[in-house]
Every structure is written in structure tokens, then in C-alpha cells.
Interface confidence: low
């Protein structure tokens, strides 16, 4: 369908029409001041140049002001994540002004047309902010624009066009198509606010990436690598909804950014932490759990401003639902020797035992081949707070790299029935907690018995030297 108001054409004319004529047509961008956390309150519509609604609706000039900006819509109505976000903001910041930017008429278009409308919507927001700045006590530094999907780029335009600098922009899975690789003035970028933080939850290296893959903020956070979100698989969606489809999977992963942000508002006592890393694979190897030199940060609303950083990519794992927080551990396992391993690639499993709880049996994801006579690094994470770790149980299984190798193993076994069992020799495991930054070394319970066959278990306890309390906590990050 054609755009009723082109990006530079009719809507721009519409905005400059005399007031008497303007009221005949519903404005394509409306500003709904949410006066209560209850979604039932219809709120108040603010009108550029009209101070009365500000007074009638109790707009607080000295408080924080949030602008929530929705994205492209197929339905033409507000989606339900919106009232969750409004409610969470009101709960967390009781005196704040929460404004929903309603640009539904311009977003309920063909995607390409909606993209073309983002600039003019950003311009409308900038004009509203310029007008508010004329009021006593209103500070642009107190303004936080929160944009979801296409709305994130709208926020970028608003930040770019406004006179002065907006305090913060949060991009919730900024839209990818038509923005990936675009010039910084045509997408959300770090120049658009004093602090730009971004959550990426639906990025794909191949196929259509609904969310933008490239970093576009001061900090760019990629939960679960920024691609496959737990609880959003087709099976999960089909299980929880009678009408689950691929569309629901897309919605679940794309919208996860919003729910992570809501989680950061309402579960303040369970903050999720992200860790700076050059790429997702290195993070999966457990290499990047440092908090030195601002290398870790809270995600969502609690993120600490790091202006010196530019396009800092950060990663974390999450649960499938609220609260999303998990507890990250780096595990360093030195494999001293293989015995009769052939072509078999070991898969390790650990169970962690702590003062508060015990974990489930956790597989150690192998990103690269297990190296012999070398230290192998892994990332594990638990949904529960285990407290201080007391002991670790380790097992392993042989997983063949190919059917051909499996056949070779079987043939070798059949031709040499008395072939002694395969074994690995592991004497210690070093563990670092991402959340506490504590390091600990675990030694084999029986130093004389450090060899382990498939399916057998080896127990490790804290080494006698105990805790190595290397505190790497950055002063800008308050770790729990």
C-alpha cells in the first residue's frame, strides 16, 4: 500500500499547516503521556505548542523523561510488550514521565515504506524535544529514548535532529534490513546521544537478519550470541501456544530484547552481566569473563555509561524467561594425556556443587578441538546461584567426529578385543566466576587417581591453597 505521508512530502507539510486545518486530520505522530503504570489509563496526548496538556497531565519538568518508540507493525495496533515496558518504567522510576510515541499510521505500511518514514518520525520527536527545552527546568540530559526494532533507528534520527544532546538512547534489537552497513547518519549510531546502549537478540549471519548485526552504540550487547534465544525454538513456541509458527519464533527472538530490558527494570536485585569480547566464539570458549578496565557491564536499564567505549561488543548467556539472569563460569581444564583415544573427540560434562545449591549436569561446549597437554577453556553457566563452589564432578563421553571415524573405532575394537580402555588424565580444574570475579582451583580428590574413562566420574575439590581472591571488579560496575 502506498505511504499516506511520504518521508519528506505530505507529512512535513502536514506538520507545518496552521492549527485550525491541522486538527482536521489525525496527526501521524502522536505523543501519549502515560500517567499511570496501569495500561487501562488512556493517558494524555501532548500537542506541540500547547502547554495545557502538560499541566493537566502532570508532566514533571525536572524528572526523567522516557520516550518509547515502537517499530514496524503488521497489525496496526500497539503490541503487548508496550504496556509491559510502560508499567516497568513507572514501577522503577515513579516520578518519571513516560511518553509513548505513536507513529502507527506510518509504521503500518510495507516495510520499505515504514523505513522511509523513520526520518520524519525522528524529526517529529526532535521538534517535540526542542519545544520542551523551551520550558524552565526541562533538561535534554534527563531524556531517555527507548526504541524497539525500527523504533531504534527513529530514536537515532531524533537524537541526531534535536538541538543539543539527548541523555541516552537504548536500542532494543534495532532493525537490520535496509540499515545493515548503512552510513551512521542513516541508522542509530553512538553520535545520537550521550550514551547509546543496544541489545541484539535476532541476528543471523545467513538468511534474513531481522535485527542489525553490526554494533551501532557505545556498548552493543549480544545475549546468547545475539542469535538463537532460549525458549524461542519452534518446539518451545509450539508447546506454549496453540498457534505457534515460524512467525512466533521470529517475534519471540526479536522481542526478547524488550523483555530483557523490562527484566532489568523490575528485577533490580537480579541484574544480568555482559562481558566484552571480540566475537561470540571466543565468548563461548569462556575466554571473556573479565571485569577489568570496564570489560563487563550490567545490561538494560542498569547499564553503566561508558562514553569512552565505542562499538564495544559484549556477550552473556540468559535463561529462557524472567528473571533472565544466569551465573557464568570460566573453566580451565588441563588435559595432561590421552590414552588410546584414536579419532574420538571427548565431550565433557560437569556438575557443580555449591554452598547454596548444586547445578544440573552441564555439557562443556566444544568450540575447537580438545588439545592434549594443553589448557582447554570452556564456558558454563547455571540458572541457580550456587554460592561458593565446593566441589566438581567431571565425566566425559567419546563423540566421534564422523561415521567413518566411528566405523574405524569399531573395527579397531573388534580386531583388538583386549585393547585397554580409553582414558584422559586431568589433575585440576581452574574456575573463575563472571559475576563475583573470584578465581578458584580444584584438584583431583585422589591425586594418585587422575585418569578417567568414558562414563566414569572424577571428583575435584578446592585445592589446599583455597581461594585466590583476585578482585578484577571495575569501579564503574557494582557487582552483587
Amino acid at each position: 500500500s502506498p505511504t499516506p505521508f511520504g518521508p519528506e512530502g505530505q507529512l512535513a507539510d502536514e506538520l507545518h499547516k496552521p492549527k485550525a486545518i491541522q486538527t482536521e486530520v489525525k496527526p501521524s505522530v502522536r505523543f501519549n503521556l502515560r500517567t499511570s503504570k496501569d495500561p487501562e489509563h488512556e493517558g494524555c496526548y501532548l500537542s506541540l505548542g500547547h502547554s495545557q496538556p502538560l499541566e493537566d497531565c502532570g508532566f514533571n519538568m525536572t524528572a526523567k523523561t522516557f520516550f518509547i518508540i515502537h517499530g514496524w507493525t503488521m497489525s496496526g495496533i500497539f503490541e503487548n510488550w508496550l504496556h509491559k515496558l510502560v508499567s516497568a518504567l513507572h514501577t522503577r522510576e515513579k516520578d518519571a514521565n513516560v511518553v509513548v510515541v505513536d507513529w502507527l499510521p506510518l509504521a503500518h505500511q510495507l516495510y520499505t515504506d515504514a523505513v522511509n518514514n523513520t526520518r520524519v518520525v525522528g524529526h517529529s520527536i526532535a521538534r517535540m524535544l526542542d519545544w520542551l527545552q523551551e520550558k524552565d527546568d526541562f533538561s535534554l540530559g534527563n531524556v531517555h529514548l527507548i526504541g524497539y526494532s525500527l523504533g531504534a533507528h527513529v530514536a537515532g534520527y531524533a537524537g541526531n535532529f534535536v538541538k543539543g544532546t539527548v541523555g541516552r538512547i537504548t536500542g532494543l534489537d534495532p532493525a537490520g534490513p535496509m540499515f545493515e552497513g548503512a552510513d551512521i547518519h542513516k541508522r542509530l549510531s553512538p553520535d545520537d546521544a550521550d550514551f547509546v546502549d543496544v541489545l541484539h537478540t535476532y541476528t543471523r549471519s545467513f538468511g534474513l537478519s531481522i535485527g542489525i548485526q553490526m554494533p551501532v552504540g557505545h556498548i552493543d550487547i549480544y545475549p546468547n550470541g545475539g542469535d538463537f534465544q532460549p525458549g524461542c525454538g519452534l518446539n518451545d513456541v509450539l508447546g506454549s501456544m496453540a498457534y505457534g509458527t515460524i512467525t512466533e519464533v521470529v517475534k519471540c527472538e526479536h522481542e526478547r530484547a524488550v523483555h530483557l530490558f523490562v527484566d532489568s527494570l523490575v528485577n533490580q536485585d537480579k541484574p544480568s552481566f555482559a562481558f566484552q569480547c571480540t566475537d561470540s566464539n571466543r565468548f563461548k570458549k569462556g575466554i571473556c569473563l573479565s571485569c577489568r578496565k570496564n570489560r563487563c557491564n550490567s545490561i538494560g536499564y542498569n547499564a553503566k555509561k561508558m562514553r569512552n567505549k565505542r562499538n564495544s561488543k559484549m556477550y552473556l548467556k540468559t535463561r529462557a524467561g524472567m528473571p533472565f539472569r544466569v551465573y557464568h563460569y570460566q573453566m580451565k581444564i588441563h588435559v595432561f594425556s590421552y590414552k588410546n583415544m584414536g579419532e574420538i573427540e571427548p565431550t565433557f560434562y560437569v556438575t557443580l556443587y555449591g554452598t547454596n545449591a548444586d547445578s544440573q549436569t552441564l555439557p562443556l561446549e566444544i568450540v575447537e578441538r580438545i588439545e592434549q597437554n594443553a589448557t582447554n577453556t570452556f564456558l558454563v553457566y547455571t540458572e541457580e546461584d550456587l554460592g561458593d563452589l565446593l566441589k566438581i564432578q567431571l565425566t566425559w563421553e567419546g563423540a566421534s567426529q564422523s561415521w567413518y571415524n566411528l566405523w574405524k573405532e569399531l573395527r579397531s575394537y573388534l580386531s583388538q578385543p583386549h585393547n585397554p580402555g580409553r582414558e584422559l588424565n586431568i589433575r585440576r580444574i581452574r574456575v573463575k566466576s563472571g559475576e563475583t570475579q573470584r578465581k578458584l582451583t580444584f584438584c583431583a580428590e585422589d591425586p594418585e587417581n587422575t585418569s578417567i574413562s568414558p562414563g566414569r566420574e572424577l571428583w575435584f575439590r578446592k585445592c589446599r591453597d583455597g581461594w585466590r581472591m583476585k578482585n578484577e571488579t571495575s569501579p564503574t560496575v557494582e557487582l552483587p
Epitope: E40, E42, G43, V100
Partner: antibody, heavy 119, light 106 residues
């Protein structure tokens, strides 16, 4: 299709409590707030309060806040409204109503549950 | 709390006639919502945001007003329109309803 099915009629003595259920189906339960509205015989409609199934957060009419408790069970997509210290004037039809998209209205209503308070 | 007063309490009209129902708020509200209720049934929304027709509601129903005075108009009464009509506000909690206007056949 969206359906709100309420529990059956109840007869209670003054001072007792009543717990009315409202089972939702045909939509994602946690995405819409649920409200309770009552109507005394031959009288108008009276809003009692609401529950947000996503968080379990509640908002009550001051008039009932000391006597009403709204809860939800996400596993069964059911909301409950319990009214305690019943008096004869609490005799009414109690409706659950789903609050529609964000800045909307009550778009779906339960069939109503008649609660009679009599000694 | 905001008190909504509806008038008249009863409106006796014939099919085909125009019905005008009034709702006055004790203090200013942003928008008004109108519901229709028939005996033994749950209410059904007619008008939201003062003047917007709810899905599936015929165009003979319309709403208007602002501030404290609001009106529901039925341009030409059909037999199925004879019922009780309630106005409601969502501006401030508790969300209140008017006492209702009964539209009956003359």
C-alpha cells in the same frame, strides 16, 4: 477464539469468603490485564480491580482493597478473585473482563458468576 | 473518585427515532467509553476514546464530547438497540461507570 469461562454460582453466608475463577483461552494469557466488575441486582456496573498476569501485579478499587485479593495461575491461564467478609450488599453478578490492546477497552467479558450472600 | 451521572435514567422511544444519551463527569476526563447491556448478558463495548466505534458496531452509533460532558447518539433506533447503556472512564482509578440509561420501546 477468545473465551473467558467463569466458575458457577455461589451461595454464601455473611462473614464468609468467596473465590471466583475465570479461565482464559484463545490468546496468550500473560499479555492482557484482567479486570473484575460486579453488578448488584437491578444496579449499575462497579469496577473492583485488576491483575496483570505477566507480573501478578494488582490494582484495586479502594472500596474493596481490604477485602479483595486477585491472583493468577499462569499454568492454567486462570485468574481468581476472592472477596472476604461478605455482606448482603455483596450479592451481585461478578464479571471478569479482558483489557484490550494497551490503550483500549474491555474487549471480552466472562459470562458472569452470581454470588448470593444470605443468612 | 470521578462520579459519572447519566441522563435521562430512562428514555422511551420508538424504532427509527434518534436517541441522545448524556454522561456528565464530576471532574474532567480525557475520554469516555460506552457499553451496551442486555438482560442476562455481559456488557458490550460500543464506543472507545469518546468517538471511536468498536469493532463490529454499526455506524448508527456515535460518540462525542470532551471535558465533563459526553454524548452517545443512536441515529435511528433498531429493535435490537433497546437495552441499558453505560458510560465509563479510564482517566483515573477507580475506573467508574455511570448509573446507566435504559432505552425502552415507547
Amino acid at each position: 477464539q477468545v473465551q473467558l469461562v467463569q466458575s458457577g454460582a455461589e451461595v454464601k453466608k455473611p462473614g464468609a469468603s468467596v473465590k471466583v475463577s475465570c479461565k482464559a483461552s484463545g490468546y496468550t494469557f500473560t499479555e492482557y490485564t484482567m479486570h473484575w466488575v460486579r453488578q448488584a441486582p437491578g444496579q449499575g456496573l462497579e469496577w473492583m480491580g485488576s491483575i496483570n498476569p505477566y507480573y501478578g501485579g494488582t490494582s484495586y478499587n479502594e472500596k474493596f482493597k481490604d477485602r479483595v485479593t486477585m491472583t493468577r495461575d499462569t499454568s492454567t491461564s486462570t485468574v481468581y478473585m476472592e472477596l472476604s467478609s461478605l455482606r448482603s450488599e455483596d450479592t451481585a453478578v461478578y464479571y471478569c473482563a479482558r483489557y484490550g490492546n494497551y490503550v483500549g477497552y474491555f474487549d471480552y467479558w466472562g459470562q458472569g458468576t452470581t454470588v448470593t450472600v444470605s443468612s | 473518585e470521578i462520579v459519572l451521572t447519566q441522563s435521562p435514567a430512562t428514555l422511551s422511544l420508538s424504532p427509527g427515532e434518534r436517541a441522545t444519551l448524556s454522561c456528565r463527569a464530576s471532574s474532567s476526563v480525557h475520554y469516555m467509553y460506552w457499553y451496551q447491556q442486555k438482560p442476562g448478558q455481559a456488557p458490550r463495548l460500543l464506543i472507545y476514546y469518546t468517538s471511536n466505534l468498536a469493532p463490529g458496531i454499526p455506524a448508527r452509533f456515535s460518540g462525542s464530547g470532551s471535558g465533563t460532558d459526553f454524548t452517545l447518539t443512536i441515529s435511528s433506533l433498531e429493535p435490537e438497540d433497546f437495552a441499558v447503556y453505560y458510560c465509563q472512564q479510564f482517566t483515573s482509578s477507580p475506573y467508574t461507570f455511570g448509573g446507566g440509561t435504559k432505552v425502552e420501546i415507547k
